[in-house]
Interface confidence: low
C-alpha cells in the first residue's frame, strides 16, 4: 500500500525528437487527492530539480495537469510531478526521463571489400549523430536466396563482416537498414559481383637477382597470391635506393597482366635498391593488396662514368732547374665510381718528350719536374675498367697567366656560400675554386673543387663554419694552362664581433683629442666591419656618439672642455650587430701648450 504511487505521468518512457515539442500529463489518484486535500491545481512540475514556470502548465480537470516543452534541446531531461501539500510541503508524485535524439539518416556511401581468404566486409556512412541507440543491419541477397542479416556491433556501427563465404561470378544485392526509437531508414541498394571487390593478399617470396652482363638491371621474382586462379592480376612495382625515403614506380602499363617476374632497367651501377610489389584485379575494379615485404639487391659494377676532378700545386721554393709539383684529385662519389675503386693511373709527358706512368692508391702524387711544360692525365680504375682521362696542362716555369674571371662575387644563400663570376671571352676548359679560413692564429688550409667550363655560378661544397672569414679564389683553366686567379672574401653567416676595439689617445689638447685604435684581428671580427661608433662623455655630461668609417684607425674629437676628465669607448659593427670595447679615460689640460694663466 505504501509503495502505491499517488499518481502517474503519461507517457511513461518517452523518446522524442530533438527540437520538437512534447507534452506530458500528470494524473492524480482520487485517494491521494482525498488524503492530501489537493487537486490538479496543486501540481508543481520540475525538470532536473528546477521548477517549471506555471505558464507552461495546463489544468485539464481536477485530477490532471499537463506541461508542454517547445524546441527540446537537451538529450536527457528528468521530469517530476509534485504536489504542494499541507504547509506548502512538496511531495513527489512521479518521475520520468525524457530522452531526446534524432531519427537515423539514410546510410550513404555503402561499399564492400573481399579480403582474400576472408569474408566480405561492407562499410557505410551512418550519417549524423542520433544520440540514441541506433542499430545498423547489413542485408544481402541473391536473386534467388536471402542471406542472414549482418548486425553491426556497437563499437563498429558503420561496418559489418558477413557470415557466409564469398561466391564469385554471381551478382549480390546489398543494402543497410538503420533503426532507432524514432524511425527506420534504408540505404540505396547496390548490386555487384564480389569478384570486383577483391583485395588480394600481397605477392610473397619477393627476391632480387643481379646481372653480370648489365650493370643497369635487376630481375625480380615473386610468388603470386592464390587468387590468381580466379582473377587476372596487375601490379605496382616500387623501388628506391637503400638510403632514400621516396619511392619510384615502374610504369603501370609494363606490369598490367599476371606474371611472376620482372626486369627493372635503367638503374645505377653498384647501387643497393629496395623493392616492393602489390597487386589487384587487372581491370582496376577492386582494391590494391597491401605491399609485399621489401627485398633488396645490388646492381653489378660498371666502369667509372667520369674522370676525377684534377688539379696541381707548385712548391714556391723550387731549386734551380727543377720544381716540386703536387698533383691532387678528388675521390669520385659512389654514383660516378660505379664500383670499388682499386687505384689511380697518372701519366706525365714532358713537352714533346718521354712519358712517365704512376699507379697510385692515394688522391695525390708529388713529383719533381723540370721547368718545362708538362701534360698530366689521370684515370681511375675499378674491377670493370677505367674512367675517361682527366687532362691537365702544367705550364712551363716562365708561363704568364692571364684572362682572369671578372665581376667575382660571393654571398650566402640558403645556408650555403655561393660564388658567381662573369666568364672570360676565351674558351675555358674548367674552373678551380679554392677556399680557406683566414685567421691570425693558423695558416690558411685550402679546400678546393672543380666546375665545368660552362659554369659561372656554384656553391662551395665543404663543411663551412659560421662567422669565419673565407678567402675564395677562382682560377679559370685553359688548354695551355691556368688563367690568373681572382680572390674575394666572404662569410657564410656574420655575427657581431667577439671583442670591440681598444681605443687610446694619440694626442690630447685643451679642446681636442686625437684617438687611435688598431683594426680588429680577423678571428674576432665575425663579419665585415662596416663602421665604428665612438662614445664619449664627461662624468656629469650626456654621452655623445660619433660614427666613423671602418677604413679609419684614428679620429679627432673637437670642442672639448679644458681641464676635464673624459670617458671614451668604441664599438665595431658587422651586418649582424656591434660590440663595445673597453672604456678609456683621459683628461684635457687646463691650458694649451705655451699658454699661461
Amino acid at each position: 500500500e505504501l509503495l502505491d504511487p499517488c499518481g502517474y505521468i503519461s507517457p511513461e518512457s518517452p523518446v522524442v525528437q530533438l527540437h520538437s515539442n512534447f507534452t506530458a500529463v500528470c494524473v492524480l489518484k482520487e485517494k491521494c487527492m482525498d488524503y492530501f486535500h489537493v487537486n490538479a491545481n496543486y501540481i508543481v512540475w520540475k525538470t532536473n530539480h528546477f521548477t517549471i514556470p506555471k505558464e507552461q502548465y495546463t489544468i485539464i480537470n481536477r485530477t490532471a495537469s499537463s506541461v508542454t516543452f517547445t524546441d527540446i534541446a537537451s538529450l536527457n531531461i528528468q521530469l517530476t510531478c509534485n504536489i504542494l501539500t499541507f504547509g506548502q510541503l512538496e511531495q513527489n508524485v512521479y518521475g520520468i526521463t525524457i530522452i531526446s535524439g534524432l531519427p537515423p539518416e539514410k546510410p550513404k556511401n555503402l561499399s564492400c571489400i573481399v579480403n582474400e581468404g576472408k569474408k566480405m566486409r561492407c562499410e557505410w556512412d551512418g550519417g549524423r549523430e542520433t544520440h540514441l541507440e541506433t542499430n545498423f543491419t547489413l542485408k544481402s541477397e541473391w536473386a534467388t536466396h536471402k542471406f542472414a542479416d549482418c548486425k553491426a556491433k556497437r563499437d563498429t556501427p558503420t561496418s559489418c563482416t558477413v557470415d557466409y563465404s564469398t561466391v564469385y561470378f554471381v551478382n549480390i544485392e546489398v543494402w543497410v537498414e538503420a533503426e532507432n526509437a524514432l524511425g527506420k531508414v534504408t540505404s540505396d541498394h547496390i548490386n555487384f559481383d564480389p569478384v570486383y571487390k577483391v583485395k588480394p593478399n600481397p605477392p610473397h617470396n619477393l627476391s632480387v637477382i643481379n646481372s653480370e652482363e648489365l650493370s643497369s638491371i635487376l630481375k625480380l621474382t615473386w610468388t603470386n597470391p592464390s587468387i590468381k586462379s580466379v582473377i587476372i592480376l596487375k601490379y605496382n612495382i616500387q623501388y628506391r635506393t637503400k638510403d632514400a625515403s621516396t619511392w619510384s614506380q615502374i610504369p603501370p602499363e609494363d606490369t598490367a597482366s599476371t606474371r611472376s617476374s620482372f626486369t627493372v632497367q635503367d638503374l645505377k651501377p653498384f647501387t643497393e635498391y629496395v623493392f616492393r610489389i602489390r597487386c589487384m584485379k587487372e581491370d582496376g575494379k577492386g582494391y590494391w593488396s597491401d605491399w609485399s615485404e621489401e627485398a633488396s639487391g645490388i646492381t653489378y659494377e660498371d666502369r667509372p662514368s667520369k674522370a676525377p676532378s684534377f688539379w696541381y700545386k707548385i712548391d714556391p721554393s723550387h731549386t734551380q732547374g727543377y720544381r716540386t709539383v703536387q698533383l691532387v684529385w678528388k675521390t669520385l662519389p659512389p654514383f660516378e665510381a660505379n664500383g670499388k675503386i682499386l687505384d689511380y693511373e697518372v701519366t706525365l709527358t714532358r713537352w714533346k718528350s718521354h712519358l712517365q706512368n704512376y699507379t697510385v692508391n692515394a688522391t695525390k702524387l708529388t713529383v719533381n719536374l723540370t721547368n718545362d711544360r708538362y701534360l698530366a692525365t689521370l684515370t681511375v680504375r675499378n674491377l670493370v675498367g677505367k674512367s675517361d682521362a682527366a687532362v691537365l696542362t702544367i705550364p712551363a716555369c716562365d708561363f704568364q697567366a692571364t684572362h682572369p674571371v671578372m665581376d667575382l662575387k660571393a654571398f650566402p644563400k640558403d645556408n650555403m656560400l655561393w660564388v658567381e663570376w662573369t666568364t672570360p671571352r676565351e674558351s675555358v676548359k674548367k674552373y678551380i675554386l679554392e677556399w680557406c679560413v683566414l685567421s691570425d692564429k693558423a695558416p690558411c688550409i685550402t679546400d678546393w673543387q672543380q666546375e665545368d667550363g660552362t659554369v659561372h655560378r656554384t656553391y662551395l661544397r665543404g663543411n663551412l663554419a659560421e662567422s669565419k672569414c673565407y678567402l675564395i679564389t677562382v682560377t679559370p683553366v685553359y688548354a695551355d694552362g691556368p688563367g690568373s686567379p681572382e680572390s674575394i672574401k666572404a662569410y657564410l653567416k656574420q655575427a657581431p664581433p667577439s671583442k670591440g676595439p681598444t681605443v687610446r689617445t694619440k694626442k690630447v689638447g685643451k679642446n681636442e683629442a686625437v684617438l687611435e685604435w688598431d683594426q680588429l684581428p680577423v678571428d674576432v671580427q665575425n663579419g665585415f666591419i662596416r663602421n665604428y661608433t665612438i662614445f664619449y662623455r664627461t662624468i656629469i655630461g650626456n654621452e655623445t656618439a660619433v660614427n666613423v668609417d671602418s677604413s679609419h684607425t684614428e679620429y679627432t674629437l673637437s670642442s672639448l672642455t679644458s681641464d676635464t676628465l673624459y670617458m671614451v669607448r668604441m664599438a665595431a659593427y658587422t651586418d649582424e650587430g656591434g660590440k663595445d670595447g673597453p672604456e678609456f679615460t683621459f683628461t684635457t689640460p687646463k691650458f694649451a701648450q705655451g699658454e699661461i694663466e
Partner: nanobody, 123 residues
Framework: QVQLQESGGGSVQAGGSLRLSCTAP????????MDWYRQAPGKEREFVSS???????GYADSVKGRFTISKDKAKDTVYLQMNSLKPEDTGMYSC?????????????????WGQGTQVTVSS
Amino acid sequence: QVQLQESGGGSVQAGGSLRLSCTAPGFTSNSCGMDWYRQAPGKEREFVSSISTDGTTGYADSVKGRFTISKDKAKDTVYLQMNSLKPEDTGMYSCKTKDGTIATMELCDFGYWGQGTQVTVSS
C-alpha cells in the same frame, strides 16, 4: 612495409606537457590518416586521437581539450601535443596508419603500427 617511428615520450609531472611525433619515411600522410593509441600496464589498448587525409581530427572523451593532433605533410610526420597531463595518461603511446574508408584504402598502406614511446606522468 611502412616503418612508423614514434618519439617524444618521457617522464613528466602532472600538469606538464609532452609532444609526441610519429614519422613514416616514404609514407605520405597526405593520402592516409593516422591514429594514436595508448596502453596502460595491465589494461587494453585504447584509442586516443586521429587525423584524416583532409585534416579532420577526433579525440577520445578523456583527452578532449587537453590533447591536439596535427600533421606536417612535408616531413611525413604526425604530432600529438599533450597538455595538462594526468597520472591516468601514463602508458605506451603508439601510432597506426589509419584504415580510413574503403574508398581510400587503395591509397594507403594501412594498418601498420609503430614500436611505441613510453609516457609516464607522476603526481
